[in-house]
Interface confidence: low
């Protein structure tokens, strides 16, 4: 598989540390929507890692939009994530385990798992691919680890793990990783996959900057963003080779990079774009 060959172009095995966002929508771009009102709102900017002001048109847009700076910080900054982590480590179910399954409003139905408070079990449901709530897990195991009781009636012991608030998965606690990588590829390689708003279902690939691999997704046929390639090879060519490992203050090791596009510098120890 050509993707696996590509995996060895980065000189060490160090994975890009995750960019931990409270909710996946914190990674959405500010969207003023099609209407023409002028409303001051706030959004979380993944590049500056701060909540910032923008002008909202009054309709549509996306969930990365908040009435106040405080609400934005509460939803999208790490402090709030740590509060959830504490409750998990205290062996209590996080509040979101008690939310009902929510498919969201999009149409790209994906198999996900949620904790059903009636049956006290994690169950499968179909997620639309956007919005929804945090009672939404990519695997049954993640759901069970976070929301189900253990055999003794207590929460499964997640000591030494941290709730990754982007996808509700468990990741090792000690993940303060130095900034080993710079990104010199196109900035759109860091954006999440975007189905777009039409109704076709085309096979495309996007670069998942979390895991450093090109992954298939279903494209609706219109809209979306530039992280959208017709083949895995094209995706890898455009995005994979943009990562450069920094080994010392001044020195850069190239990893078979073919493009020198715009220079987008990201400190990877704190931010992370969710595979959506």
């Amino acid at each position: 598989d050509s993707e696996e060959d590509e995996e060895h172009t980065i000189i060490t095995d160090t994975e890009l540390p995750p960019l931990k966002l409270m909710h996946s929508f914190c990674a959405f771009k500010a969207d003023d929507g099609p209407c023409k009102a002028i409303m001051k709102r706030f959004f979380f900017n993944i590049f500056t890692r701060q909540c910032e002001e923008f002008i909202y048109g009054g309709c549509e847009g996306n969930q990365n939009r908040f009435e106040s700076l405080e609400e934005c910080k509460k939803m999208c900054t790490r402090d709030n994530a740590n509060r959830i982590i504490k409750t998990t480590l205290q062996q209590e179910k996080p509040d979101f385990c008690f939310l009902e399954e929510d498919p969201g409003i999009c149409r790209g139905y994906i198999t996900r798992y949620f904790y059903n408070n009636q049956t006290k079990q994690c169950e499968r449901f179909k997620y639309g691919g956007c919005l929804g709530n945090m009672n939404n897990f990519e695997t049954l195991e993640e759901c069970k680890n976070i929301c189900e009781d253990g055999p003794n009636g207590f929460q499964v012991d997640n000591y030494g793990t941290q709730l990754n608030a982007v996808n509700n998965s468990l990741t090792p606690q000690s993940t303060k990783v130095p900034s080993l990588f710079e990104f010199h590829g196109p900035s759109w390689c860091l954006t999440p996959a975007d189905r777009g708003l039409c109704r076709a279902n085309e096979n495309r690939f996007y670069y998942n900057s979390v895991i450093g691999k090109c992954r298939p997704f279903k494209y609706s046929g219109c809209g979306g963003n530039e992280n959208n390639f017709t083949s895995k090879q094209e995706c890898l060519r455009a995005c994979k080779k943009g990562f450069i490992q920094r080994i010392s203050k001044g020195g850069l090791i190239k990893t078979k990079r073919k493009r020198k596009k715009q220079r987008v510098k990201i400190a990877y120890e704190e931010i992370f774009v969710k595979n959506m």
Epitope: G104, R107, Y109, I110, T111, K126, N201
Partner: antibody, heavy 117, light 106 residues
Framework: EVQLQQSGPELVKPGASMKISCKAS????????MNWVRQSHGKNLEWIGL????????TFNQKFKGKATLTVDKSSSTAYMELLSLTSEDSAVYYC??????????WGQGTTLTVSS | QIVLTQSPTIMSASPGERVTMTCSAS?????MHWYQQKPGSSPRLLIY???ILSSGVPVRFSGSGSGTSYSLTIRRMEAEDAATYYC?????????FGAGTKLELK
Amino acid sequence: EVQLQQSGPELVKPGASMKISCKASGYSFTGYPMNWVRQSHGKNLEWIGLINPYNGDTTFNQKFKGKATLTVDKSSSTAYMELLSLTSEDSAVYYCARGTYEYVDYWGQGTTLTVSS
Amino acid sequence: QIVLTQSPTIMSASPGERVTMTCSASSSVFYMHWYQQKPGSSPRLLIYDTSILSSGVPVRFSGSGSGTSYSLTIRRMEAEDAATYYCQQWSSYPLTFGAGTKLELK
């Protein structure tokens, strides 16, 4: 237990319209899209389209645009398909089927439609 | 749209025999799904995502394949397996089914 209960067989005249119902139970109705599939001559299966009961969005096979209208009543967990301007070509068994954008996992028992003068 | 061609159209097998049927896609697809339909009944999901058995499906059934070529195998044919089997994709719009393979008991 997931169940999809469809309305009974129909005999209609060419040019008429008719509506098939599909009552869902045993799962969260708004959590899954409802697909509709046609089976002609007891053989070929053709996907007509789907409706997302959560927000009423529909997606159709181009072939059936203008032929079928999909609606839901969330309060009764019922999906409906109305077939318009019927001809003998539309005689078939019509299924509602719970599903996803990739496959369907539970099927109704089917509604037989006969279009004849 | 993607056309799915199933072969053979009709086949027969004796109890205990190994059965394999194929589904060929006109373009590459990510996953193939399989349904079983018996006369007078609705289709039933048998295998989804190429190889995952649906709930309650006996382990003698298996699915495999990738790209444009997929197959369904019954390790040891049983009388109750006599049915028509359909493959289905929705990697590309619209969702399409194969024309079916009718499996008869010899």
